[in-house]
Amino acid sequence: IWELKKDVYVVELDWYPDAPGEMVVLTCDTPEEDGITWTLDQSSEVLGSGKTLTIQVKEFGDAGQYTCHKGGEVLSHSLLLLHKKEDGIWSTDILKDQKEPKNKTFLRCEAKNYSGRFTCWWLTTISTDLTFSVKSSRGSSDPQGVTCGAATLSAERVRGDNKEYEYSVECQEDSACPAAEESLPIEVMVDAVHKLKYENYTSSFFIRDIIKPDPPKNLQLKPLKNSRQVEVSWEYPDTWSTPHSYFSLTFCVQVQGKSKREKKDRVFTDKTSATVICRKNASISVRAQDRYYSSSWSEWASVPCS
Amino acid sequence: RAVPGGSSPAWTQCQQLSQKLCTLAWSAHPLVGHMDLREEGDEETTNDVPHIQCGDGCDPQGLRDNSQFCLQRIHQGLIFYEKLLGSDIFTGEPSLLPDSPVGQLHASLLGLSQLLQPEGHHWETQQIPSLSPSQPWQRLLLRFKILRSLQAFVAVAARVFAHGAATLSP
């Protein structure tokens, strides 16, 4: 058993049929010695008396808010949560496996630049009695500070018969060094509590591996005289690291109709302009990627050919 | 050339060669990018490799103030990786094909280090750690980790030279 926060404790249980469970001793936080009784949740049934209560925690029915009282007055609470371990593996019932970029990916994180700011998100089908708490650091043995905000519900989607909820959190490394080569990964730890179930999820990454620039901005077209060709120009996204002579991007320019199966023109360039062939009812799209490190491409920025 | 006396390197040549190093580092093992090597316990490998750190002057302001600190750090790293790629980690079993991207990578690391430090000038270099894995599978894993680390190192070096070529070239 360990303390998650004040008056909230996590009991770690091996979860299998007829498991013996864990013996837990609760102590009432009071100078009083006599006339103390214990109850669980809203029940008025007295579970025991005395300053301490010893219980055998085996299942969710044994978890909850234990309260010690004296003469009708509440002295203190202890909330017990369960953390299940099945076949040596901690349960992951609360969050959905996003399966990208690999199986058992519960947390996904992205950064728009090298400033040390990043966003992580996760999915669940649970809509109520759900809380998250996020901590982060650079490295684990001698951790350097990363400050995370509160996790918020960022999107709701309908998937078949189920509703899916996306939560996200923004974090910022306290002393980021955008130009340095990272040697210690960022660690992100998410505590998830659903009713009386506790689970924790972690992710470890270098900022360079989660970079995904915003799409290029200000796409403009200039038709070339006596030609089917069009010069398309664009700018670096505002959110990308500066100076651009140091933090350079490379670009993919594509002309395509509405359907992915339609024919297309495609060219890669390090410049912020390119010459392509525009077709009626097609769009010109441009996306960006770090020039020197193969992290994710940005989403496409598009303008119609016409 | 970035000689210890403090003259400027051939920024444009260094830029071209460092960009080539980036391409080579990713083509030497593109799948490295899809392996989560941190799960394999990185400490003994990548903690020993020279990283370009915050105080090394490789940021745009540091380069403007005095590029020598950064160039020396890059040179150290190039020599270090060049030695690693020439060591039995890469020459032992399972054997790499001759003329593989690793071979070209090795040659290009040497080429860039020589551009930075001509014959007769010497910056101190970092000792290469004694990493001699006994099993072929350990060697393979170590290769992946070294290449992954090299990808990060040459990306920073390429940024430095691109910025230098754009803003510091005479």
């Epitope: 089917r228 890669f268 062939i277 | -």
Partner: antibody
Framework: EVQLVQSGAEVKKPGATVKISCKAS????????LHWVRQRPEKGLEWMGW????????EYAPKFQGKVTITADTSTDTGYLELSSLRSEDTAVYYC???????????WGQGTLVTVSS | DIQMTQSPSSVSASVGDRVTITCRAS??????LHWYQQKPGKAPKLLIK???QSISGVPSRFSGYGSGTDFSLTINSLQPEDFARYYC?????????FGGGTKVEIK
């Protein structure tokens, strides 16, 4: 199977005009760009130009501008290359090539040898 | 126009050898480079697109690398059917241009 079948070899006199064809099958003709590429005897490949069969748009290499005309007939799924004012240096194998992507060549015809000789 | 220079113009090799052909562009073309194989009397065949992207149906012994101005095509463990002429082609800008070709012949 995507296929391009070209018309047979031609022998022409200098100053004449020749029109060679390229019949597409195995795909929707207007879904691919169609290019023509020249290969002179014992020489390399030279891109001549392309056509978008969907709308008839064409683009030619400056070297071949005025010398060649590329057309397409969507009713017969056939592309054409017309070469005018033939000279002996126009003796070559002419390939049609197609792709959904404009700038490289995924599918090739078997080639048509045009010989210009007096 | 962008000039493409291939080297060597010919190379002699044996079955099982590893062969590398290089292609240099007269200006930077990013990764807009493609490789073709042509056997005598036949049309060219696409091997690699955008410098390093493999083409389905092409044996994995063919690999490409490069960006900017310098590119290479490597054939690992040369097979009897690989003796042919190889061309690079840039697609950075029109007119599209090819390298002069490299003939891989039997030693």
């Amino acid at each position: 199977e995507v296929q391009l079948v070209q018309s047979g070899a031609e022998v022409k006199k200098p100053g004449a005009t020749v029109k060679i064809s390229c019949k597409a099958s195995g795909y929707t003709f207007s879904d691919y760009y169609l290019h023509w590429v020249r290969q002179r005897p014992e020489k390399g490949l030279e891109w001549m130009g392309w056509i978008d069969p969907e709308n008839g748009d064409t683009e030619y290499a400056p070297k071949f501008q005025g010398k060649v005309t590329i057309t397409a007939d969507t009713s017969t799924d056939t592309g054409y290359l017309e070469l005018s004012s033939l000279r002996s240096e126009d003796t070559a194998v002419y390939y049609c090539a197609a792709n959904k992507e404009l700038r490289y060549f995924d599918v090739w015809g078997q080639g048509t040898l045009v010989t210009v000789s007096s | 126009d962008i000039q493409m220079t291939q080297s060597p113009s010919s190379v002699s090799a044996s079955v099982g050898d590893r062969v590398t052909i290089t292609c240099r562009a007269s200006q930077s073309i990013s990764i807009n480079l493609h490789w073709y194989q042509q056997k005598p009397g036949k049309a060219p065949k696409l091997l690699i697109k955008f410098a390093s992207q493999s083409i389905s149906g092409v044996p994995s012994r063919f690999s490409g690398y490069g960006s900017g101005t310098d590119f290479s095509l490597t054939i690992n463990s040369l097979q009897p059917e690989d003796f042919a002429r190889y061309y690079c082609q840039q697609s950075n800008s029109f007119p599209l241009t090819f390298g002069g070709g490299t003939k891989v012949e039997i030693k």
